[in-house]
């Protein structure tokens, strides 16, 4: 079950809930946002203060790390299995250091399996964080510091920090190095969403959340 099911069961307060893998008894803890846009959102990534190191291994990105109370990555394997069952939408919420907020909404999102390096698939972009997708299209394979699957001769994850769907290296990286205010410009290895804030701006906060399209 996911946060949408939990919401529909009557638990409509945002917080940490135990989710289960599809067709399995395996459990995972996640933050459920029951407030934004009608609720039912499973948060798969959150950055807010730099308290968690996002330069992690393939295994850690597969299984998840951090704390759902703060900064965390839910885990590629769970997200892949979940989004392979039904059609999901992806909402990405962004905050800059000047108090502005923006979002990108994709009307269809799924991750391929590990055998395809958790390649991201996205369609139907709307929102205020750029008219062009800052996640390269068509989707790229996921790369980490110990698993280089990008389209660059270089190793984007090693160079730019964090696991992400790097292209060469691509116009985004929400898992980049966290830079505090006044140190967040001209930082190519920061938390980047190019088509909102440009080439070298590192964001203050990000949230990636998913929900069934038919919610």
């Amino acid at each position: 079950r996911d946060c949408a099911e939990i919401f529909k069961s009557g638990l409509t307060t945002s917080g940490i809930y135990t989710l289960t893998f599809p067709n399995s008894t395996e459990e995972i803890k996640a933050y459920c946002d029951m407030d934004v846009g009608g609720g039912g959102w499973t948060v798969i990534q959150h950055r807010e203060d730099g308290s968690v190191d996002f330069q992690r291994t393939w295994k850690e990105y597969k299984e998840g790390f951090g704390s759902p109370l703060g900064e965390y990555w839910l885990g590629n394997e769970f997200v892949s299995q979940l989004t392979g069952q039904h059609r999901y939408v992806l909402k990405i919420q962004l905050k800059d250091w000047e108090g502005n907020e923006a979002h990108s909404l994709y009307d269809h999102f799924y991750l391929a399996g590990e055998e395809s390096n958790y390649r991201i698939h996205l369609t139907g972009l709307t929102g205020t964080a750029g008219k062009i997708s800052s996640i390269s299209q068509p989707g790229s394979d996921f790369s980490t510091k110990d698993s280089d699957n990008d389209k660059c001769i270089c190793k984007c994850s090693q160079m730019l920090s964090g696991g992400w769907w790097f292209d060469a290296c691509g116009p985004s990286n929400l898992n980049g190095q966290y830079y505090p205010q006044k140190q967040n410009t001209n930082k190519f290895n920061g938390i980047k969403w190019y088509y909102w804030k440009g080439s070298g701006y590192s964001l203050k906060a990000t949230t990636m959340m998913i929900r069934p399209a038919d919610f």
Epitope: C154, M159, L160, D167, A168, C169, G170, N186, K187
Partner: antibody, heavy 122, light 107 residues
């Protein structure tokens, strides 16, 4: 095979203008930041300018700011450098350069053209 | 602007020698440094990026190290084709700047 072919160099008088072109092939041009680097005769390398994949972000060395303009046409796989108000100190071989990544704020050049010579003299 | 200072400006060496070239930045550039090789009349060639990452196709006798302000390019066993001029370049901040070059000559 990646190829970068510059053209447009030549002899020009001080105060004059030139437009350099760089035809790119062998890679997905629209996915990479592109740069111009120059080298005066017998001297070292000097970075001139870089442009983002979309062309929306451009940066210049102080020595050419306000005089040179970098641009690109992704439909033609071509990079340009417009040189105006040329000075004797602009005399150099101008290299078209493919960046290792698409990150305009981090220039590592992994492929270079053969260079085109610009001579500014009266 | 960040100034990049290479030393020595030239070095005489023999085939088989170990050659070390240093590059110093005027301020902290973390690991955002590249090394290039240039032969007379030719375009430069990328050897090392991000201080120590070997560019694809470059022989393993070339290696880079350092971070912050002090960097080193080492050629472990000099080959005849390695006689050239070597440049460092910082990629930390605009404007991107090169060192003055180190010419490796035949002794």
């Amino acid at each position: 095979e990646v190829q970068l072919l510059e053209s447009g160099g030549g002899l020009v008088q001080p105060g004059g203008s030139l437009r350099l072109s760089c035809a790119a092939s062998g890679f997905t041009f629209r996915k990479y930041a592109m740069s111009w680097v120059r080298q005066a005769p017998g001297k070292g390398l000097e970075w001139v300018s870089v442009i983002s994949v979309s062309g929306g972000n451009t940066y210049y060395a102080d020595s050419v700011k306000g005089r040179f303009t970098i641009s690109r046409d992704n439909s033609k796989n071509t990079l340009y450098l417009q040189l105006n108000s040329l000075r004797a100190e602009d005399t150099a071989v101008y290299y078209c350069a493919k960046d290792l990544t698409d990150i305009v704020l981090m220039v590592y050049v992994d492929y270079w053209g053969q260079g085109t010579l610009v001579t500014v003299s009266s | 602007d960040i100034q990049m200072t290479q030393s020595p400006s030239s070095v005489s060496a023999s085939v088989g020698d170990r050659v070390t070239i240093t590059c110093r930045a005027s301020q902290d550039i973390d690991r955002w440094l590249a090394w290039y090789q240039q032969k007379p009349g030719k375009a430069p060639k990328l050897l090392i990026y991000a201080a120590s990452s070997l560019q694809s196709g470059v022989p393993s006798r070339f290696s880079g190290s350092g971070s912050g302000t002090d960097f080193t390019l080492t050629i472990s066993t000099l080959q005849p084709e390695d006689f050239a001029t070597y440049y460092c370049q910082q990629a930390n901040s605009l404007p991107f700047t090169f060192g003055g070059g180190t010419k490796v000559e035949i002794k």
